[in-house]
């Protein structure tokens, strides 16, 4: 149930994720710790990397609200009821800043992807001989 | 805006392998979930399969013997096969894309398959 | 497999009605559950994702509801463009399974 309602969550994240690459060109055009191919076990610490990394609004134009609103989003903290096991990987799986850092859009695309990968597997573990290759 | 077109041909004889291509504009197949959905006539939508943009697949068991689905990213486009075709395939045969895993966001409109003689 | 149930099959309403349409799990699937409107010829389109929430670009008079096994989709003030036929569709597990439809028609 618990897991539930962390994957439910990083459905929605996938939304706000969408919406923010619309505004790629709104967002300071920095180089953020974007994780890729990221090892089993460690999706929760990269996750964690995602949302500690600083994406900015540029400050430009009409989208500066909107933008806002959906970073701070992107950065609420998921129930914590996994957190014990989140701790117990943090210290094997590489830091933050030994990620590739990449500008916004494709630190967008990464996020989404690892979203994905998170929502598949646990479909799958859901599900009995899902996986076909 | 993501826009799917799905087309193949329209007949199918018995026994043979249905195939259908999915083309994809205003978009990237190089991330997401690719899927098939089909709708036989007067009857509800059957989820087929999906893959996804690194080539994983999933498919429903009811069809796994008989079904690829597979994805060519330099064209931007996913493909269908389904083999031994019978007229119990005869479907609307959508293609769809999931961003979210669990839904599918964007859909084409459908192409019909008539499997017959 | 998850069977999906939907009901009424069919719904006769007017433009401004409330419309709700039912959609029943034969087992629980917390809030994996999606709505489609679909109306013929044309490409269906996502209308709530994760029971409640609504897909980007789609009218708030479209709501859902609903955890574990019931779930409902509800059109607050029904439009011209509304009738169509709707789906619920789970995703809680493989294979991803539809429920038969409810079509909503002029009165």
């Known amino acids: 149930q618990g897991q539930d309602r962390h994957m439910i969550r990083m459905r929605q994240l996938i939304d706000i994720v969408d919406q923010l690459k619309n505004y790629v060109n709104d967002l300071v055009p920095e180089f953020l710790p974007a994780p890729e191919d990221v090892e089993t076990n460690c999706e929760w610490s990269a996750f964690s990397c995602f949302q500690k990394a600083q994406l900015k609004s540029a400050n430009t134009g009409n989208n500066e609200r909107i933008i806002n609103v959906s970073i701070k989003k992107l950065k609420r903290k998921p129930p914590s009821t996994n957190a014990g096991r989140r701790q117990k990987h943090r210290l094997t799986c590489p830091s933050c800043d030994s990620y590739e850092k990449k500008p916004p859009k494709e630190f967008l695309e990464r996020f989404k992807s690892l979203l994905q990968k998170m929502i598949h597997q646990h479909l799958s573990s859901r599900t009995h001989g899902s996986e076909d290759s | 805006q993501v826009q799917l077109q799905e087309s193949g041909p329209g007949l199918v004889k018995p026994s043979e392998t249905l195939s259908l291509t999915c083309t994809v504009s205003?978009?990237?197949?190089?991330?997401?979930?690719w899927g098939w959905i089909r709708q036989p006539p007067g009857k509800g939508l059957e989820w087929i399969g999906y893959?996804?943009?690194?080539?994983?697949?999933n498919y429903n068991p009811s069809l796994k013997r008989r079904v690829t689905i597979s994805v060519d990213t330099s064209r931007n486009q996913f493909s269908l096969k389904l083999s031994s075709v019978t007229a119990a395939d005869t479907a609307v045969y959508y293609c769809?894309?999931?961003?979210?895993?669990?839904?599918?966001?964007?859909w084409g409109q459908g192409t019909l398959v008539t499997v017959s003689s | 497999d998850i069977q999906m149930t939907q009901s009424p099959s069919s719904v006769s309403a007017s433009v401004g009605d409330r419309v709700t349409i039912t959609c029943r799990a034969s087992?629980?699937?917390?809030?994996?559950l999606a709505w489609y409107q679909h109306k013929p010829g044309k490409a269906p389109k996502l209308l709530i994702y994760?029971?409640?929430s609504l897909q980007s670009g789609v009218p708030s008079r479209f709501s859902g509801s609903g955890s574990g096994t019931d779930f409902t989709l509800t059109i607050s003030s029904l439009q011209p463009e509304d009738f169509a036929t709707y789906y619920c569709?789970?995703?809680?597990?493989?294979?991803?399974?539809f429920g038969g439809g409810t079509k909503v028609e002029i009165k």
């Open positions: 769809a894309r999931s961003a979210g895993v669990t839904d599918f966001d964007f």
């Open positions: 205003g978009g990237s197949i190089s991330s997401d979930f």
């Open positions: 893959i996804s943009s690194r080539g994983s697949t």
């Open positions: 087992q629980g699937i917390s809030s994996w």
């Open positions: 994760v029971a409640s």
């Open positions: 569709q789970q995703a809680a597990s493989f294979p991803l399974t």
